[in-house]
Amino acid sequence: LQDLCSNCPAGTFCDNNRSQICSPCPPNSFSSAGGQRTCDICRQCKGVFKTRKECSSTSNAECDCISGYHCLGAECSMCEQDCKQGQELTKKGCKDCCFGTFNDQKRGICRPWTNCSLDGKSVLVNGTKERDVVCGPSPADLSPGASSATPPAPAREPGHSPQ
């Protein structure tokens, strides 16, 4: 009898009520592997979640976050508010990056500008709240008489985060 069930493909279940015939998964359920005795109910993408991939008879629905939010955790198990580039999310909401830090994404924290001088280089393009500095050649590499117009950017102390 076990062998009969093992013949049931994904998208079906082994129906004990019908002499172990392979029955299709009912609506809003799925089986992703063969030989299942039941089909699993599909995940609902409701509230702060929206559907990224519809449930089918062989695979579960996949959720995403509604506009203005991004997923956290396994299988998009929590939604967190997006911020603008140049900001980070704090307990008080989205806050601009402090001077000397940047964030080029809608999520995550502000990070210190690269300290070009640590690599013996000079600042070619200044950093902003949205963009890191661009380091250029070291002052020694510049032709005589040429010098960097911008001093190296200060690095933020590790562990410091604006509240």
Partner: antibody, heavy 115, light 107 residues
Framework: QVQLQQWGAGLLKPSETLSLTCAVY????????WSWIRQPPGKGLEWIGE???????DSNPSLKGRVTFSVDTSKNQFSLKLNSVTAADTAVYYC?????????WGQGTLVTVSS | EIVMTQSPATLSVSPGERATLSCRAS??????LAWYQQKPGQAPRLLIY???TRATGIPARFSGSGSGTEFTLTISSLQSEDFAVYYC?????????FGGGTKVEIK
């Protein structure tokens, strides 16, 4: 820090309408879903329903259409009304922010239904 | 609706010991499960979401595991402030449902 502060009548007679309001301070109001949960004395938690800032709602079928949610985005507030209350509706009622799980909660309001 | 069942109803543990709380779903909910802590007279507090991810500010002694229908919350070394009631909750399907709770008390 996101804070939820709630208020409403604490003592009702059977058949009256329960009315509670929750104000959100700090953080964002728009975009999130806001929920109500209740807890009868000495018992577990029951989800009542939710509302988004846009006004879209969902509620627990167990409440059989007795529940109404509303939102006032100008004040960052949302409200619950539960009509035709009975002694079985006696509980601590909580408002909460729904981000998948409930990540921020109000302090709770004890509502007693007694004749 | 998905029924969530927690066991044991009460768990007696000495401070410093490990506590293991169980939660079972009536059908598979993947990892879409949260754990909350509630102390007397207070609102619940989110501990874990996605079955295993600690919420912001939650100490590392709290850990969650499991997937499908069987889930576990482990408190590695109980502190005095951890004695409380713990609830699991699924948000895989609506209506959202909670377990009946496990009270962790001092032995």
């Amino acid at each position: 820090q996101v804070q939820l502060q709630q208020w409403g009548a604490g003592l009702l007679k059977p058949s009256e309408t329960l009315s509670l309001t929750c104000a959100v301070y700090g953080g964002s109001f728009s975009g999130y879903y806001w929920s109500w949960i209740r807890q009868p004395p000495g018992k577990g938690l029951e989800w009542i329903g939710e509302i988004q800032h846009s006004g879209s709602t969902d509620s627990n079928p167990s409440l059989k259409g007795r529940v109404t949610f509303s939102v006032d985005t100008s004040k960052n507030q949302f409200s619950l009304k539960l009509n035709s209350v009975t002694a079985a509706d006696t509980a601590v009622y909580y408002c909460a922010r729904l981000t998948g799980p409930f990540d921020y909660w109000g302090q709770g309001t004890l509502v007693t239904v007694s004749s | 609706e998905i029924v969530m069942t927690q066991s044991p109803a009460t768990l007696s543990v000495s401070p410093g010991e490990r506590a293991t709380l169980s939660c079972r779903a009536s059908q598979s909910i993947s990892s879409i499960l949260a754990w909350y802590q509630q102390k007397p007279g207070q609102a619940p507090r989110l501990l874990i979401y996605g079955a295993s991810t600690r919420a912001t500010g939650i100490p590392a002694r709290f850990s969650g595991s499991g997937s499908g229908t069987e889930f576990t919350l482990t408190i590695s070394s109980l502190q005095s402030e951890d004695f409380a009631v713990y609830y699991c909750q699924q948000y895989y399907n609506w209506p959202l449902t909670f377990g009946g709770g496990t009270k962790v008390e001092i032995k």
